[in-house]
């Protein structure tokens, strides 16, 4: 997605994007919370590809681990959290049962904030 | 995705979240910045299923439409912005060839900064 | 700039090891797959083997299965290939190459020769 | 496995001339093939992928059509660096990734 600091913006939580393989994630949550397989290829006409995914989430060694950048810290604690979105993908379940069905992807780092109480 | 508010916590940027249809998106842009048709229908082994992409963006009615939440406003100017990822989708392009695509949607609201030069 | 430097080519003997490496940088390597692609001296392009992004995935060609081992190591930016029992037809340039989403090859190393030969 | 056939081998052209280069496929590959070029002591470049979508810094020169087993690379007007041999690969169904044999295009 496009970069913020390509304008002179910073973020409030540095975050890491990447494509990862359904070979490389194996598994994944659907929406009713049970676990599938992720199938390493999808079907097209006489053929197939590979199951791709688009993941960003928090980045662990950035500046913003510790906290979120920009936030008034005489008010606020904060944190930046990985949020996940739903995508439909190829996959198999625990009854060995194959369709598409979305399952949860981390797509975002965002930042979360708790009034502090006590000054 | 999990609600922060559920734990006694705020976002720094208000977002909503949708399901919408390939009958409503009707278009999209594909990885290489072209524009494409994105399909109602997926062929599956028996039959069609509707294709849906779930949505996340900025609330435009929200608290954060001004400037982020949390915000150091002494020292940052803030805004909540959109932010795309990428999901592979049934498309067909600008030479009615159908195929598997990646396109971009809209999946976080995230909090961007610049910093205030003068005082 | 995406870059890909191939080493560890050379001149072996029937049924001898060598192992082949490949520095990666220019981009976010664990997001790519990789593939080792030959070419025997006056031939075309033959595929070997091809690695997804976390080492999850891995796929040979069938003139080198079991006698060929390809890995990665993200933290180095490197990619390998192991090469066992090797034979004269295995003679030939070693290509590392990025593999798209799709499944061609955006980026070529320079190659390595490796020449088995008695 | 899909077997990739390039034809011709060799095409003896001048500068200014047309090339016309074919890859037909053993079964239909949807439009799921790439084309790539390789100078003497060089990689292969990629050209087209997609059938017919030219890769970053391509010129317009090369143009890549066809779908299904049938495909072709255009040159519309050889310059002196398009003389080299030319690859098509297909990525629809792997493993194993196939090439074509390649086409050799030399000055008449």
């Known amino acids: 997605h496009s970069d913020p600091a390509r304008r002179g913006e910073l973020s409030v939580c540095d975050s890491i994007s990447e494509w990862v393989t359904a070979a490389d994630k194996k598994t994944a949550v659907d929406m009713s919370g049970g676990t599938v397989t992720v199938l390493e290829k999808v079907p097209v006409s006489k053929g197939q590809l590979k199951q791709y995914f688009y993941e960003t989430k928090c980045n662990p060694m950035g500046y913003t681990k510790e906290g979120c950048r920009g936030i008034d810290k005489r008010h606020w604690n904060s944190q930046c959290r990985t949020t996940q979105s739903y995508v439909r993908a190829l996959t198999m379940d625990s009854k060995k049962r194959i369709g598409w069905r979305f399952i949860r992807i981390d797509t975002s780092c965002v930042c979360t904030l708790t009034i502090k109480r006590g000054r | 995705h999990s609600d922060p508010a559920r734990r006694g916590e705020l976002s720094v940027c208000d977002s909503i979240s949708e399901w919408v249809t390939a009958a409503d998106k009707k278009t999209a842009v594909d990885m290489s910045g072209g524009t494409v048709t994105v399909l109602e229908k997926v062929p599956v082994s028996k039959g069609q299923l509707k294709q849906y992409f779930y949505e996340t963006k900025c609330n435009p009615m929200g608290y954060t439409k001004e400037g982020c939440r949390g915000i150091d406003k002494r020292h940052w100017n803030s805004q909540c912005r959109t932010t795309q990822s990428y999901v592979r989708a049934l498309t067909m392009d600008s030479k009615k060839r159908i195929g598997w695509r990646f396109i971009r949607i809209d999946t976080s609201c995230v909090c961007t900064l610049t910093i205030k030069r003068g005082r | 700039d995406v870059q890909l430097v191939e080493s560890g080519g050379g001149v072996v003997r029937p049924g001898e090891s060598l192992r082949l490496s490949c520095a990666a940088s220019?981009?976010?390597?664990?997001?790519?797959?990789m593939n080792w692609v030959r070419q025997a001296p006056g031939e075309g392009l033959e595929w070997v083997s091809g690695?997804?992004?976390?080492?999850?995935?891995?796929y040979y060609a069938d003139s080198v299965k079991g006698r060929f081992t390809i890995s990665r190591d993200n933290s180095k930016n490197t990619l390998y290939l192991q090469m066992n029992s090797l034979r004269a037809e295995d003679t030939a340039i070693y290509y590392c190459?990025?593999?798209?989403?799709?499944?061609?090859?955006?980026?070529w190393g320079l190659g390595t020769l490796v020449t088995v030969s008695s | 496995e899909i077997v990739l056939t390039q034809s011709p081998g060799t095409l003896s052209l001048s500068p200014g001339e047309r090339a016309t280069l074919s890859c037909r496929a053993s079964?239909?590959?949807?439009?799921?093939l790439a084309w790539y070029q390789q100078k003497p002591g060089q990689a292969p470049r990629l050209l087209i992928y997609?059938?017919?979508t030219r890769a970053a810094g391509i010129p317009a020169r090369f143009r890549g059509s066809g779908s299904g087993t049938e495909f072709t690379l255009t040159i519309s007007s050889l310059q002196s660096e398009d003389f080299a041999v030319y690859y098509c690969?297909?990525?629809?169904?792997?493993?194993?990734?196939?090439f074509g044999g390649g086409t050799k295009v030399e000055i008449k």
């Open positions: 190459v990025r593999e798209t989403l799709n499944i061609f090859f955006d980026y």
């Open positions: 220019g981009f976010t390597f664990t997001s790519y797959a």
């Open positions: 079964q239909a590959i949807n439009y799921y």
């Open positions: 690695i997804s992004g976390r080492g999850g995935g891995i």
């Open positions: 690969q297909q990525y629809n169904n792997w493993p194993p990734l196939t």
């Open positions: 997609d059938a017919s």
